[in-house]
């Protein structure tokens, strides 16, 4: 199915994400004890480190091109709060489009 096809994409994107996070941490002077939100791979897409009060925007991840190849890709945000990252807004399916009646290929 398309989820299985996505596994390879995920592994590649995850590796790239961890590299990006490392570079961003160095640029921003982030370490484990820094206030704010560490960069993370949420198993769907990559989120750069952020300071408390900062909103981070990302384009819809590659996974949704598999679900909806013809759809314009949307944007998802997370807020960095004192308690860590908020959940995505909107949630991925609403932001990025998902046809639940599309048959698996």
């Amino acid at each position: 199915g398309s989820m299985a096809h996505s596994d390879g994409i995920f592994k590649k994107e995850q590796a790239m994400c961890l590299e990006k996070i490392q570079r961003a941490n160095e640029l921003m002077g982030f370490n484990d004890s820094s206030p704010g939100c560490p960069g993370m791979w949420d198993n769907i897409t990559c989120w750069k480190p952020a300071h408390v009060g900062e909103m981070v925007l990302v384009s819809c991840p590659e996974l949704f091109r598999i679900f909806n190849p013809d759809q314009d890709m949307g944007v998802v945000s997370r807020n960095c709060t004192e308690d860590g990252w908020s959940e995505p807004f909107p949630h991925y399916f609403d932001a990025c489009g998902f046809d639940e009646y599309e048959s698996e290929t």
Epitope: N43, S77, S86, P88, F89, P90, H91, E104
Partner: antibody
Framework: QVQLVESGGGVVQPGRSLRLSCAAS????????MHWVRQAPGKGLEWVAV????????YYAESVKGRFTISRDNSKNTLYLQMNSLRAEDTALFYC?????????????WGQGTLVTVSS | EIVLTQSPATLSLSPGERATLSCRAS??????LHWYQQKPGQAPRLLIK???QSLSGIPARFSGSGSGTDFTLTISSLEPEDFAVYYC?????????FGPGTKVDIK
Amino acid sequence: QVQLVESGGGVVQPGRSLRLSCAASGFTFSRFAMHWVRQAPGKGLEWVAVISYDGGNKYYAESVKGRFTISRDNSKNTLYLQMNSLRAEDTALFYCARGYDVLTGYPDYWGQGTLVTVSS
Amino acid sequence: EIVLTQSPATLSLSPGERATLSCRASRAVFGNLHWYQQKPGQAPRLLIKYASQSLSGIPARFSGSGSGTDFTLTISSLEPEDFAVYYCHQSSMLPFTFGPGTKVDIK
């Protein structure tokens, strides 16, 4: 149409274990997050746990953390809730619900629930 | 965790009247606020997502508004089938939470 059918509820003594199941049909189960939400008799809704589409992300309410485990078998279109060290305050109708997302989402379709009674 | 407070706890109204239900969050929920209706003996039903987005199959008399920490569900003209309990739910910060509910009953 989306259908969620919970099972596994019953009467259990405090300290014992129970496993709930939720059989899903009418949608591509392996693409959706899934939630458990409970409702004590005559009370409001309490969110319990969520699992991402592939089981890679699991999150719990503080009241059940360390006692309950959410899991899924995408080959069987089934969601599970393993409940250990049950307490009287766990007595509730347990609903499984589809999360409209791959990671967490908000519950959009709900089952009819299975009743768990913890009593000696 | 984010605590959701709903008011009033009970709203006694007549069919045809307007119902205004409030949900207040202890911290900002960044738009991830949703409304559910529950009738006795039934599972909850999603009414409104993301504070104000309507859903197909839900009557137009149901509408939502608000942002940040203060949200409102409005039923423009109550129908007999609208007498039920209404819950708000935040999916912004884990652990997710529900409000305690507002019961709309017949005056």
